[in-house]
Each structure stands twice: as structure tokens, then as C-alpha cells.
Amino acid sequence: DTHKSEIAHRFKDLGEEHFKGLVLIAFSQYLQQCPFDEHVKLVNELTEFAKTCVADESHAGCEKSLHTLFGDELCKVASLRETYGDMADCCEKQEPERNECFLSHKDDSPDLPKLKPDPNTLCDEFKADEKKFWGKYLYEIARRHPYFYAPELLYYANKYNGVFQECCQAEDKGACLLPKIETMREKVLASSARQRLRCASIQKFGERALKAWSVARLSQKFPKAEFVEVTKLVTDLTKVHKECCHGDLLECADDRADLAKYICDNQDTISSKLKECCDKPLLEKSHCIAEVEKDAIPENLPPLTADFAEDKDVCKNYQEAKDAFLGSFLYEYSRRHPEYAVSVLLRLAKEYEATLEECCAKDDPHACYSTVFDKLKHLVDEPQNLIKQNCDQFEKLGEYGFQNALIVRYTRKVPQVSTPTLVEVSRSLGKVGTRCCTKPESERMPCTEDYLSLILNRLCVLHEKTPVSEKVTKCCTESLVNRRPCFSALTPDETYVPKAFDEKLFTFHADICTLPDTEKQIKKQTALVELLKHKPKATEEQLKTVMENFVAFVDKCCAADDKEACFAVEGPKLVVSTQTALA
């Protein structure tokens, strides 16, 4: 449905508050280095213009596309060239190339300071101006996470303000705020990673990849919904994610609201678990639907083999409508197996497709495909065995020890990858243990595999920016669903030429003593990566010795009266003992 003025249409649909929030997110995700006040100015300009268009849709410029209006605002920024370099060249292009150009300049790891919550300062800011506080949160998250799912960020901003509403009245602000902020931080990071994977799926593998992922996920959540209903939901959801990933945040939020309305209007045929969600206001409703628990599997479902292995018409059905038939296979398999990971279900569908491609070309297709379900079994066994081994190791070592084991494992596999990336990724991989190994058996596989997909996507996104390893490129680009098995199958890189020992990397100062525990761990883990890059064949025993020496050195100097002097004297000794231990 076309509107004379797209900006007026979206303003009316979304309302002023959401409109302004989404515009602020959009600008912050594109111009990640601009100060908050600069963005506020742009948002206010565009909002005033939108109001003009609401009053008179024929007003000059109101007919322009949102990309044109947004792009024109971005290109008005005075410091564009000096702050963003060649991003300024985007302004010489016409739409839609200009928007594509802006998108390509989004930075997944912008050089921005870590956000450190200070309860008193934050409460003062909150009390001074709640609206500004809300906007500042949107801005700070959006610029650090340029692909964050915009309507969901509005939800988190409201939650964030709610936390301050509650805690700034409390006796001990810090005790109330800090755990709540930390819990939210974890959720926000997970939400960011999920959306980054969705956007990467579309950008690198096409929307068919995201559709397949969504069919599996929604079929697990809504096993009572019919295949055609699930397909409709997937089509609409894919449109929403495509829009958000493409920077069309107003359309994305509007369409997401429509989808939530459709789901709630049709909850009788979708899921019995939606009642509570559908009673909530819009942002909470959409969030709740996205997080809703899986409905019970309908009773008396026929065996999968009936339609997909025993039926003599399998090849006819497949060849007449490949996507629909494979979609129904994925739907039927997924709704019967809520205990499987989405990525595993996608591997099953991929293998099923490969089997049909092979069998349907034969003289007796039925004889060939009738045993397909036996062929698929290994795809379920492999992750189950891997989860068992890794959870056993996690239980033995604890999170920090498990992270270190993963640092060793991954640095040996891909030593060319930058040290900060190896530390970040290995630390995240190690957290899988804490997140997933404690879960009941029925939830372990989806928890593990799907969380690993997020982390490996982060590795792929960071690596794509500065590619250094052919192995990483291969695992990242060959197959989205087989990324995890591809990385698991990597062996230590025998072609790697070890790095020369760099004393600077093992020189520490008194500032390490005052670092929070997490930061201390990162310092130690950074040293571990560097050791391995220098001596990839170091034994577990050698690494243990060196790391114990390092911990003793830090503990000793942090306990000394003159810490800096201690680090200056003991540091070179540590370097010598390290080189000796690794000789």
C-alpha cells in the first residue's frame, strides 16, 4: 500500500516517541562516533519535518523516500570527512547506492570506551531528565551495536529506565542497580549477537537462509500451527528482519507491530502459550512473543517417514516444489523435536535435500531414499557427543579453566587471528559451559549449538573486516549451518610460523592491580594467547608452569609496597623464566 508521504505514514503509525527513538537509533548506528547532542539535533530536525508532512502530505520534500531523507540528514554532518574518512564519499552517490554505502561502513567493533555504570552519577542524570536518559541509552547501545534490532532496543531502553525508576529511590542505589544492570547487559549482548547473525545470514547467504532458520525455530515454538501458517509467519518475520538489517528501522518496527497483532489475533491456531504476551503493551508484547516458551507437541503425529521416506511420490513432490517440500520437511522435523538445536535441524534438512538430489536422479529413487532417516542419525549423534565431552571438561575445570582450554584449542587451530579476537571468542565459548551445561538434557543441545552459532558468527564478522586465515574464511563462508562442525574439525595449524618473542607483551605495570577480576583474567588470557603464538607446540605442563609463574608474579608485585618498582624488577625475571620454561 503506497502512501503519498512515507515519513508521515510512519510517524502516524509509530507515534512520536517511538519515531524519535528509532530515528536516533538509525543515526547512531550509522554515525557511531558522533556526540549524542549532534544526533539529538538531527533527530529533532527530522521529527519536525515529519510533523510538517503529517499536517500536509503535499509539502515540499514529503514525498521523498525515507532513505533519501535520512541520507540527506547524514550528509549534512559537518565533520563527516574528518571523523569517518571515506564514508563521506557515500554522499556523492544516489539512492539506493548511497544507503548501501552507509551500511557497508558500519563498524562491528568501534573504538569506544567501555561503559562503566556509576550508580550515583547515573541516578543524577536520570532524575535530571528521564527522556534524555532514555535517549542516551539508545544512543550508547546503538553506536556500539550497529545491527541491534531497533524495536527490541526500544524495549530494553524502557526496561532500563524502569530499573532506574525503582533503584534510584533505594537506600543502597548500587546494591539495587548493579545486579539488575548486569543481568540486562547479558540479555542485551545476547540480543545483539542474535540480530547480528540474522543480518549476516541475509547478507552473506541470502534471505532463504534466514527463512529456513525461522521455519525451524517457529515450528519448534508453535508445533500446533499448520505448515502454511508457519510459512506466513516466517515470510512476515523475514521482511521485518530484512528491513532492520537494511537500516529501514521505521518500516521494520511498524511491520513488527503488525506481525505481533496478527499473531495475537490468531493465537488460537498458533500457540496456547501466547495469552499472557498478548495482554501486554506493544513493545513488551513483541518481546514476549519472541521469547515465548515452546508449546506442547500435538498428540498422534504420524511418523516422519510416511511423507518423506515411504511415500512413492517423494521425488515428484520434491521436483514440483523444492522449497515448499523441503520447508515442510523442516517444519515436520522441527515441530517433533524441540530438544534439537535449530542449526542441527537445518543440517538434517540440508542432508535430506542432498539425498533427494542424488536419489531422484536414479532408476529406483524409492529404494535409494527409503533409508534416508538412517543416514541422518549421525547429524544428531555428533553434537550430542561433543556436548558431553565439553560439558565434562567444563565441570572439571570451571568457567575460567574451560576458557583457557578453549584459548589453547582455538589459538592452535587459527593462530593468525588477532589476539583480542581470540581472547573475546574463547571467553564467550567458555561461557557456554556456564549457560548450557547446567541445563536439563532436553535443553542442552539447542542451548549449546545455537549459542555457538552466535559466537562463531562474531568471529566471522570480525575476521571478515581483516581476513588473516584461509581456514577461518572457509569455515565462515562455505555453509552457514556447518560453521560449528567446520571449526570443530579444524586441527592445529602445522603451516604456522611462530611469532618472535616480544618482551613488550609481557611487560606489566601497577595498574593491573586495581583492575576488576574480569579485566585481570583478560590480561592473563591475552598473555596465554601470545605464548601460544610464540610456542604453538608448548605442552600443557609448560603452559601451566608459565601461567602459574605469571600469577605468582602479579600477586607478589600487587602486594608490594612499591608496586611499580616490583614490576620493573620482577618483570624481566618473568620473561627469562618464561623463555626458559618454553625452551
Partner: antibody, heavy 122, light 108 residues
Framework: QVQLVQSGAEVKKPGSSVKVSCKAS????????ISWVRQAPGQGLEWMGG????????NYAQKFQGRVTITADESTSTAYMELSSLRSEDTAVYYC???????????????WGQGTLVTVSS | EIVLTQSPGTLSLSPGERATLSCRAS???????LAWYQQKPGQAPRLLIY???SRATGIPDRFSGSGSGTDFTLTISRLEPEDFAVYYC?????????FGQGTKVEIK
């Protein structure tokens, strides 16, 4: 409440084709599948085939393969059934019905059109 | 394909009586995927029962379905004047969909 409204009665010559339409309202056309069933005078019901409008994917009973074409237009929420090379034994009432999915083009039929009588006579 | 045979062909009963209609399949119907429809002259069929025993929306509770495998039954506990019609069973456990030839319930 889903409603399926079919086009009017047709009289056709043998060898010609007929195209029957079925317009859906109430509910969302893209979230269900449509089947076509026929009933010769004084006879039972016979399944001809079906379509998933959101995919544009059709499936036909062996008996009608090559002679029937089922299509759908999502923009108008309308399904169509075209039967070619008509003969006198194709004289029947043709019904469209919504399939409640039970498997690949299998299901029970919960809402029916009012039927379209097609008479094939020279 | 699965062939469905309905019996009897015609059932002559009085209002208030119990009607028992049978539908036998040539092979087992997967997951009891069997439906029953009622059709009155000049009208489209109307869904009564699906999944062998689940009543469709708005269907009075005097209609009940049972059975599994190859033998299925539709029971009308007390016939009302509006129940005199033709009844069809249909299986959707395997392709293609097939219908029985129908049972006519007439007033005695």
C-alpha cells in the same frame, strides 16, 4: 470466520476448458491451503488437487494430472481451478475448500465454497 | 491409494433413534487421520469430525466419532430431523485424499 465464494455456473462444449474461481474472505489467505473437490450428479466426492498460495505450489491427483491447473492470486485472495479437454463425464459440481494441514497436501476440509456447477454438453 | 468403504449404503431410521455409520479403510489410516462430513441436497459438505474423534466447531455433541487403524464409526446418539442427509468419511493419512462413497441416512 472464513468464507469461500465461487464463480457462477458454466455450460461448456466438449474439448473446451473451464476456469472456476474461489474468493476467500475472513482470515488470511496466505496462511492456508486450498483444495478442489468435485461431485458428479448423484455421486460421491472426488479430490482433484490443492494449492499453497504463499508458495504458489500446487499438487494434483494422478487422475487429473496434465488436465487440471490450480493457481492462486494472493493480491485478490482468489484461487482458481482450470480443467481442460472437457468431456461429458466432467459434468459436476466443483467445490473449493480450505485444507487444515495434516501433511503434504493432506488434511481435512473445514470451510467449503458453495459449489460451481459445470455442465459439459454439445 | 487408500480405498474407503462405507456401510450401510442407506440407513432408514426415525427421529430420536441412534445412528451408527461405518467406514472401513483398505489399509491402516495413519494417526487416525479420518474426517466425517454431512451433506444435504444442494449444499456443500460440512465438516463434523476430524482426527477420527474431534468434533468440529459448532457441531452438536450428539455427533461422535471413534475408531483407529482400518475401522471407524460415526455415531449420532439421537437423530434430529435436520440430521437426515448423506454422510461421507475421508482419510488424510496418506496421499491422495480419498472419500468413502457415502451413507444416506433417511427417515423411516
Amino acid at each position: 470466520q472464513v468464507q469461500l465464494v465461487q464463480s457462477g455456473a458454466e455450460v461448456k462444449k466438449p474439448g473446451s476448458s473451464v476456469k472456476v474461481s474461489c474468493k476467500a474472505s475472513g482470515g488470511t489467505f496466505s496462511s492456508y491451503a486450498i483444495s478442489w473437490v468435485r461431485q458428479a450428479p448423484g455421486q460421491g466426492l472426488e479430490w482433484m488437487g490443492g494449492i499453497i498460495p504463499i508458495f504458489g505450489t500446487a499438487n494434483y491427483a494422478q487422475k487429473f494430472q496434465g488436465r487440471v491447473t490450480i493457481t492462486a492470486d494472493e493480491s485478490t485472495s482468489t484461487a482458481y481451478m482450470e480443467l481442460s479437454s472437457l468431456r461429458s463425464e466432467d459434468t459436476a459440481v466443483y467445490y473449493c475448500a480450505r485444507i487444515r494441514w495434516g501433511g503434504w497436501f493432506r488434511g481435512y476440509l473445514d470451510y467449503w465454497g458453495q459449489g460451481t456447477l459445470v455442465t459439459v454438453s454439445s | 491409494e487408500i480405498v474407503l468403504t462405507q456401510s450401510p449404503g442407506t440407513l432408514s431410521l426415525s427421529p430420536g433413534e441412534r445412528a451408527t455409520l461405518s467406514c472401513r479403510a483398505s489399509q491402516s489410516v495413519s494417526s487416525s487421520y479420518l474426517a466425517w462430513y454431512q451433506q444435504k441436497p444442494g449444499q456443500a459438505p460440512r465438516l463434523l469430525i476430524y482426527g477420527a474423534s474431534s468434533r468440529a466447531t459448532g457441531i452438536p455433541d450428539r455427533f461422535s466419532g471413534s475408531g483407529s487403524g482400518t475401522d471407524f464409526t460415526l455415531t449420532i446418539s439421537r437423530l434430529e430431523p435436520e440430521d437426515f442427509a448423506v454422510y461421507y468419511c475421508q482419510q488424510y493419512g496418506s496421499s491422495p485424499l480419498t472419500f468413502g462413497q457415502g451413507t444416506k441416512v433417511e427417515i423411516k
